[in-house]
């Protein structure tokens, strides 16, 4: 089961994913893949991090624009198209056997609404899509008995479960973000 997020064609999509490094700065590898989380690793990797930084991106449209070093590994997909729709896997690769946290999020890309641009556009869109759309309880795609956990206390912060509607205001936020 996965949480759904909506973005308009041409805008930026934001797929939240985070963990709490413990102690601060003790980062773990993360991968984002197109497709639901598989048993191992990520399928169709779009972005991968190591213990220090992003080290693999399949396209310049994929970014981690949050504070990566504090565990915000939310994925931004720039200038989305209908082809970007689908399930994405965020996998937080906690050391140890079967300790990974796996989170499936679904991106729904819609065509821009044919409305006259107005200051109330974002409010109107938000009222049309009041909260998040979910297909069930979010969290790990499967429950597994973890092995002995290392010194990484993972508290996945329920992934900012608001439905994200992207309009031009997001572009302003993105333009001021630090690109890592």
């Amino acid at each position: 089961s996965e949480v759904e997020y909506i973005a308009e064609v041409g805008q930026n999509a934001y797929l939240p994913c985070s963990y709490t490094p413990a102690p601060p700065g003790n980062l773990v590898p993360v991968c984002w893949g197109k497709g639901a989380c598989p048993v191992f690793d990520c399928s169709n990797v779009v972005l991968r991090t190591d213990n220090r930084d992003v080290n693999d991106r399949t396209s310049g449209r994929y970014w981690l624009k949050g504070d990566f070093h504090k565990g915000d590994v939310s994925l931004t997909i720039e200038n989305v198209t209908l082809a970007d729709s689908g399930v994405y896997c965020c996998r937080i690769q906690i050391p140890g056997i079967m300790n990974d946290e796996k989170h499936n999020v679904k991106l729904v890309v819609i065509k821009p609404a044919k409305v006259t641009p107005a200051p109330t556009l974002q409010r109107d869109l938000t009222s049309a899509f009041p909260r998040m759309l979910t297909t069930g309880e979010h969290g790990p795609a499967e429950t597994q008995t973890p092995g002995s956990l290392p010194d990484v206390n993972l508290t996945v912060s329920n992934f900012f479960c608001e439905l994200q509607i992207f309009t031009l205001t997001n572009e302003l936020r993105d333009s001021g973000a630090t690109i890592r």
Partner: antibody
Amino acid sequence: EVQLVESGGGLVQPGGSLRLSCAASGFTFSTYWMTWVRQAPGKRLEWVANIKQGGGDKYYVDSVKGRFTISTDNAKNSLYLQMNSLRAEDTAVYYCARGSNWFDPWGQGTLVTVSS
Amino acid sequence: EIVMTQSPATLSMSPGERATLSCRASQSVYDNLAWYQQKPGQAPRLLIYGASTRATGIPARFSGSGSGTEFTLTISSLQSEDFALYYCQQYTHWPITFGQGTRLEIK
């Protein structure tokens, strides 16, 4: 051409040991997950174990945990499966394969027969 | 563990015909499904992964579809070399599991 060639199979008595080898060529072996899959006579394929290259994480199906050990030697581009305390139900053709979730390509297989 | 059930167990067809093989998962595996072909005395060969993506070098007559629990492998026009054993495999849930196979034989 990507190629995997297994060796080391044979006849062994219950409780005995065998070490299977898989020689890889045609790709950068050290960057890929590698997997062992087996097929008992008349039975479906069964995933046995795999190893994450670099990180070294190793995963096993429950029925072989504590008895089988998967390993690699990147200098030799080789994958291994050390099989101890073998049982009759371990009789199968053992394949090595490249990949973590789906497998491509596969070796030709080596037959392991556990019988007294 | 996830049980993968393939049907039919045996499919008798003639060259040039369209073959449809089915695979059902005991619970949703999303699109995390692969198909393999195996000929007697040979290793399995990957045909499809991600439910519908053809592996490198696989002819266009092979196509995969489905999501969740129901999947299909279609061979649009059977060639003599297509008569073999076909397996599906899920890779969403631990452990990875395979179907029991469908034997495609010449009628």
